[in-house]
Interface confidence: low
């Protein structure tokens, strides 16, 4: 008799794929544009990335460091009007993209939370949550919560408002902290909070250290849902050399939790390559004309247009991973088991019941390595087969779909492999 199927877990929409942050509308759209009406024209692009949610803004009125001139209920006219926002929500809904609004109050100022007027600001946030929930947003983000006194209790209250409106609404908190204990204390009192932090940003470039960070985090957070990113707002290129971008994309999309990216991560957007551009929000490179300041500074392979036409590009990899992440049960909500694969490597299995299973092997090092996969580390429910099919490699040159012998697996420098194999009773 066939074994009973495992009951599917309740899945919220943010469990089903990546979130995409657009913190700076002007930089994202470029060409002196940068409003809500223009963003609506980019929703098809977001659809092509298969992202599930757009984390937008902040876009509210905020006069630098002035509480009285900060209105969380009003959109800064430079970004658009309430009707433009409404229109964006409508179009996004039609494309199945959820909209999360960043309500970090003093986003133009020194202290995001006006340190001297915490209660006034907290009340403003409460009112804003209720107002924007009524307007149809799918969730909220607040950043820099390490600057918010009594953050845990405020977050719990805001979470109650958000969840009280609908279980389908999401609250994201962001912190610059990379300290696990600090992160855990924020999570403790907030069951469903999604927290973005700098926890992974100092993972360096060793597989062992990354493995240790990931497993520590997952063990410490138990079976609560988490998110994966390298910071609360910044680009991957702020932390990673170009040769590790593909590896991290593969990892972020295949760890258990919600991957969170910033605009430009999908093309390896790098402020350092664009003289005069701010590190935190460089102009998005749609095509070679997106950065006219220095003619010739932008080549086609740095842009969305150029990478869209190249099946071997970072953007093409992002799209493929995003697609897999959103449709494979084992990647959507499967169990996670990390195991030893040799020095410099990080490897893990994702599996769910009798569905197709996935093996991820990541070589963080700058030399080619043979993987010594230690299957003995794995529980019986997650045993390794002798061979697995190559779904994709982060490096060109491998024949996709071909079976690879796991005992004789060799990885190129900075290569990541995503392999699939069937459930065997």
């Amino acid at each position: 008799r066939a074994p009973r199927c495992r009951e599917l877990p309740a899945q919220k929409w943010w469990h089903t794929g990546a979130l995409y942050r657009i913190g700076d509308l002007q930089a994202f759209q470029g060409h002196g544009a940068g409003n809500l009406a223009g963003l609506k024209g980019r929703l098809d692009y977001l659809s092509s990335l298969k992202v599930k949610g757009l984390v937008l803004g902040p876009i509210h009125k905020n006069q630098k460091d002035d509480v009285a001139q900060t209105d969380l209920l009003q959109i800064d006219p430079n970004f658009g009007s309430k009707e433009d926002f409404d229109s964006l929500l409508q179009s996004a809904k039609k494309k199945s993209i959820r909209v999360i609004l960043d309500l970090t109050p003093n986003y133009r100022g020194e202290n995001s939370w006006f340190s001297t007027q915490v209660d006034t600001v907290a009340t403003k946030v409460k009112d804003a949550l209720e107002f924007w929930l009524q307007a149809g947003v799918d969730g909220f983000q607040v950043r820099d919560i390490e600057n918010l006194k009594d953050a845990s209790s405020f977050l719990a209250e805001w979470q109650n408002i958000t969840k009280g409106f609908s279980e389908d609404r999401l609250l994201i908190a962001g912190t610059n902290s990379s300290d696990l204990q600090q992160i855990l204390s924020l999570l403790e009192s907030n069951k469903d909070l999604l927290l973005t932090s700098s926890y992974l940003s100092d993972s360096g470039s060793t597989g062992e250290h990354t493995k240790s960070l990931v497993t520590q985090y997952l063990n410490a957070t138990g079976n609560r849902w988490c998110s994966w990113s390298l910071s609360q707002a910044r680009l991957l290129t702020s932390f990673l050399p170009a040769q590790l971008l593909r590896l991290y994309q593969l990892m972020l999309f295949t760890l258990p939790g919600t991957p969170v990216f910033s605009y430009g991560d999908e093309i390896g957007l790098d402020a350092a390559a664009l003289p005069g551009q701010p590190m935190e929000a460089p102009v998005m490179l749609w095509d070679e004309s997106s950065f006219p300041d220095i003619p010739g500074a932008v080549s086609a392979n740095m842009t969305v247009k150029g990478q869209s036409e190249d099946p071997g590009s970072l953007l093409s990899l992002f799209r493929r991973l995003s697609d897999q992440r959103s449709k494979e049960r084992s990647l959507l909500h499967g169990d996670f088991h990390a195991f030893s694969a040799g020095p410099g490597l990080f490897s893990y299995i994702r599996h769910w019941d009798q569905n197709e299973r996935f093996l991820v092997v990541l070589n963080f090092g700058d030399v080619g390595l043979s993987a010594g996969l230690q299957a003995s580390d794995l529980p019986a429910s997650a045993s390794l087969p002798a061979k697995a099919d190559l779904l994709l490699s982060t490096q060109p040159g491998r024949e996709e779909g071909s079976p690879l012998e796991l005992e004789r697996l060799k990885l190129e420098p900075h290569e990541g492999l995503l392999l699939r194999f069937p459930y065997a009773a």
Partner: antibody, heavy 120, light 106 residues
Framework: EVQLVESGGGVVRPGGSLRLSCAAS????????MTWVRQAPGKGLEWVST????????GYADSVKGRFTISRDNAKNSLYLQMNSLRAEDTALYYC?????????????WGQGTLVTVSS | EIVLTQSPATLSLSPGERATLSCRAS??????LAWYQQKPGQAPRLLIY???NRATGIPARFSGSGSGTDFTLTISSLEPEDFAVYYC????????FGQGTKVEIK
Amino acid sequence: EVQLVESGGGVVRPGGSLRLSCAASGFTFDDYGMTWVRQAPGKGLEWVSTISWNGGGTGYADSVKGRFTISRDNAKNSLYLQMNSLRAEDTALYYCAGYCIITGCYADYWGQGTLVTVSS
Amino acid sequence: EIVLTQSPATLSLSPGERATLSCRASQSVSSYLAWYQQKPGQAPRLLIYDASNRATGIPARFSGSGSGTDFTLTISSLEPEDFAVYYCQQRSNWWTFGQGTKVEIK
């Protein structure tokens, strides 16, 4: 042909209630935000209330907040304004207007109005 | 609440003359400003949206300009049918209308 037809106006005593309706045809109603605008006899235009395409977002002028409620039924292509605790200063011709949020334009479809008179 | 102040209250001109109507906002509305024309017994008619864009079917003699807090509606050469009341309207934060400018025959 686009049409917005208001109804439900009439004479009512101060403190009384009325419910205005606006029937829409000739355009895709649920692509449009809808608004009530009023005009007291011999006076200018005054915005009253707006509702978003899906009914999720609503806004009210300070003068009617807490007394008037805007709603819509997309299945019936209809917009409503429930007016309670009416005052003499609410006497006006009430227009319903549709603004096309798909292109981010202004209220470009207007009805001919329904007259509300609040008098003892 | 954003207050819109129109000037002048009344403008007396002859057909063929140029009309310049002004609208000032109490705070910046970016370019989220419209102009409407209203004739007695009729509903308002949209002329200009987003400060300078002519609505469908509006003659080229009507033009709008401005951004932030100061806006202008210009009718380059008045036709007999242009004598009416003109309202500006913002949609930066919900809606508000100006009090109107009446353009009458001199």
